[in-house]
């Protein structure tokens, strides 16, 4: 008789999840020589231990602590790029500007990027059928708790000038309910961070509005200022040109506004 299985509202664990995490770990340690000492089997064991046999609505930051220890990594605190709702461009940017880091450029972020996972209480099985949805089921699910944990710690590590890339095509350019708005903004350390600089990325080629005047950006400025951190904002009118100029800063067309 098949055992009754909890049906959740969200998609199930990404297929071949264990193999994917292990393969990503091996690849990361090959690409980043300073991480070549990492034992990827131990990393997988710690990752698995955070959610296997646990109720997927009852996961805590403490569950991920063994994984956090194994993911210890040097990140230059003044080279951190946060992003909200514009992940692809942020990653394209750090692929060119190699001295800057998004969370997904770290081992832990790289391992989990775009993956879903959950287990079941009291069984060692991974649930490939369904996992809890943050809104419809519960917020303390394995994926949400992981990203909240690493996002908080990433923000806490930041110093000097912190950059954030925001999507100017969205109705809420700054969204208080995003990971950036709900976690990272509130965990920047005012004693370490001097300025948060927002880069608002325009979508339309003919869009010449100053999106730094958007009400949601003013809301972000207010939140940041109340935390005794300075705020600045730049429009990136041409993201394609912006990336091109990061690649070739000496290009004559790169002196004009982008």
């Amino acid at each position: 008789v098949p055992r009754w299985r909890q049906q959740w509202s969200g998609p199930g664990t990404t297929k071949r999840f264990p193999e994917t995490v292990l393969a990503r770990c091996v690849k990361y340690t090959e690409i980043h020589p300073e991480m070549r000492h990492v034992d990827c089997q131990s990393v997988w064991d710690a990752f698995k231990g955070a959610f296997i046999s646990k109720h997927p609505c009852n996961i805590t930051e403490e569950d991920y602590q063994p994984l956090m220890k194994l993911g210890t990594q040097t990140v230059p605190c003044n080279k951190i790029l946060l992003w909200s709702r514009i992940k692809d461009l942020a990653h394209q940017f750090t692929q060119v500007q190699r001295d800057m880091f998004t969370l997904e450029d770290t081992l832990l972020g790289y391992l989990a990027d775009d993956l879903t996972w959950c287990g079941e209480f009291n069984t060692s099985k991974i649930n490939y059928q369904s996992c809890p949805d943050w809104r419809k089921d519960c917020s303390n699910n394995p994926v949400s708790v992981f990203w909240k944990t690493v996002s908080r710690r990433f923000a806490e590590a930041a110093c000097d000038v912190v950059h954030v890339m925001l999507n100017g095509s969205r109705s809420k350019i700054f969204d208080k309910n995003s990971t950036f708005g709900s976690v990272e903004v509130h965990n920047l350390q005012p004693e370490k961070v001097q300025t948060l600089e927002a880069w608002v990325i325009h979508g339309g080629r003919e869009d010449s509005r100053d999106l730094c005047q958007d009400p949601t950006i003013k809301e972000l400025e207010s939140i940041i200022s109340k935390r005794n951190i300075q705020f600045s904002c730049k429009n990136i009118y041409r993201p394609d040109k912006f990336l091109q100029c990061v690649k070739n800063p000496e290009d004559s067309s790169c002196t004009s506004e982008i």
Partner: nanobody, 117 residues
Framework: EVQVLESGGGLVQPGGSLRLSCAAS????????MSWVRQAPGKGLEWVSG????????DYADSVKGRFTISRDNSKNTLYLQMNSLRAEDTAVYYC??????????RGQGTLVTVSS
């Protein structure tokens, strides 16, 4: 600006003890959790131990549990690491850093601990 200065390293025989110190400045020390991390020759960064801002909560890597003790004196803005029963594999440069990781940008020069007979 966060600044730290580690001291107390040296050459010690296996089974011996050392006490590392880290003098911190440029920030409200008691507001920040702190960690010790280390880097062995030719190896990557390894988290060793962490302590909460108040000092009430501590945590250790499995490899040092029961041998190392982290502590802090907030009145002196100083972090400590008492290392007992030292082993050859504890040989490394030890750094103190703000936060509990896993992301660190250590600001000090570190202090070298060599365990050898």
């Amino acid at each position: 600006e966060v600044q730290v200065l580690e001291s107390g390293g040296g050459l010690v025989q296996p089974g011996g003890s050392l006490r590392l110190s880290c003098a911190a400045s440029g920030f409200t020390f008691s507001n920040f959790a702190m960690s010790w991390v280390r880097q062995a020759p030719g190896k990557g960064l390894e988290w060793v131990s962490g302590i909460s801002g108040s000092g009430g909560s501590t945590d250790y890597a499995d490899s040092v549990k029961g041998r190392f003790t982290i502590s802090r004196d907030n009145s002196k803005n100083t972090l400590y690491l008492q290392m007992n029963s030292l082993r050859a594999e504890d040989t490394a440069v030890y750094y103190c850093a703000d936060g509990t990781g896993p992301f660190f940008d250590y600001r000090g020069q570190g202090t070298l601990v060599t365990v050898s007979s």
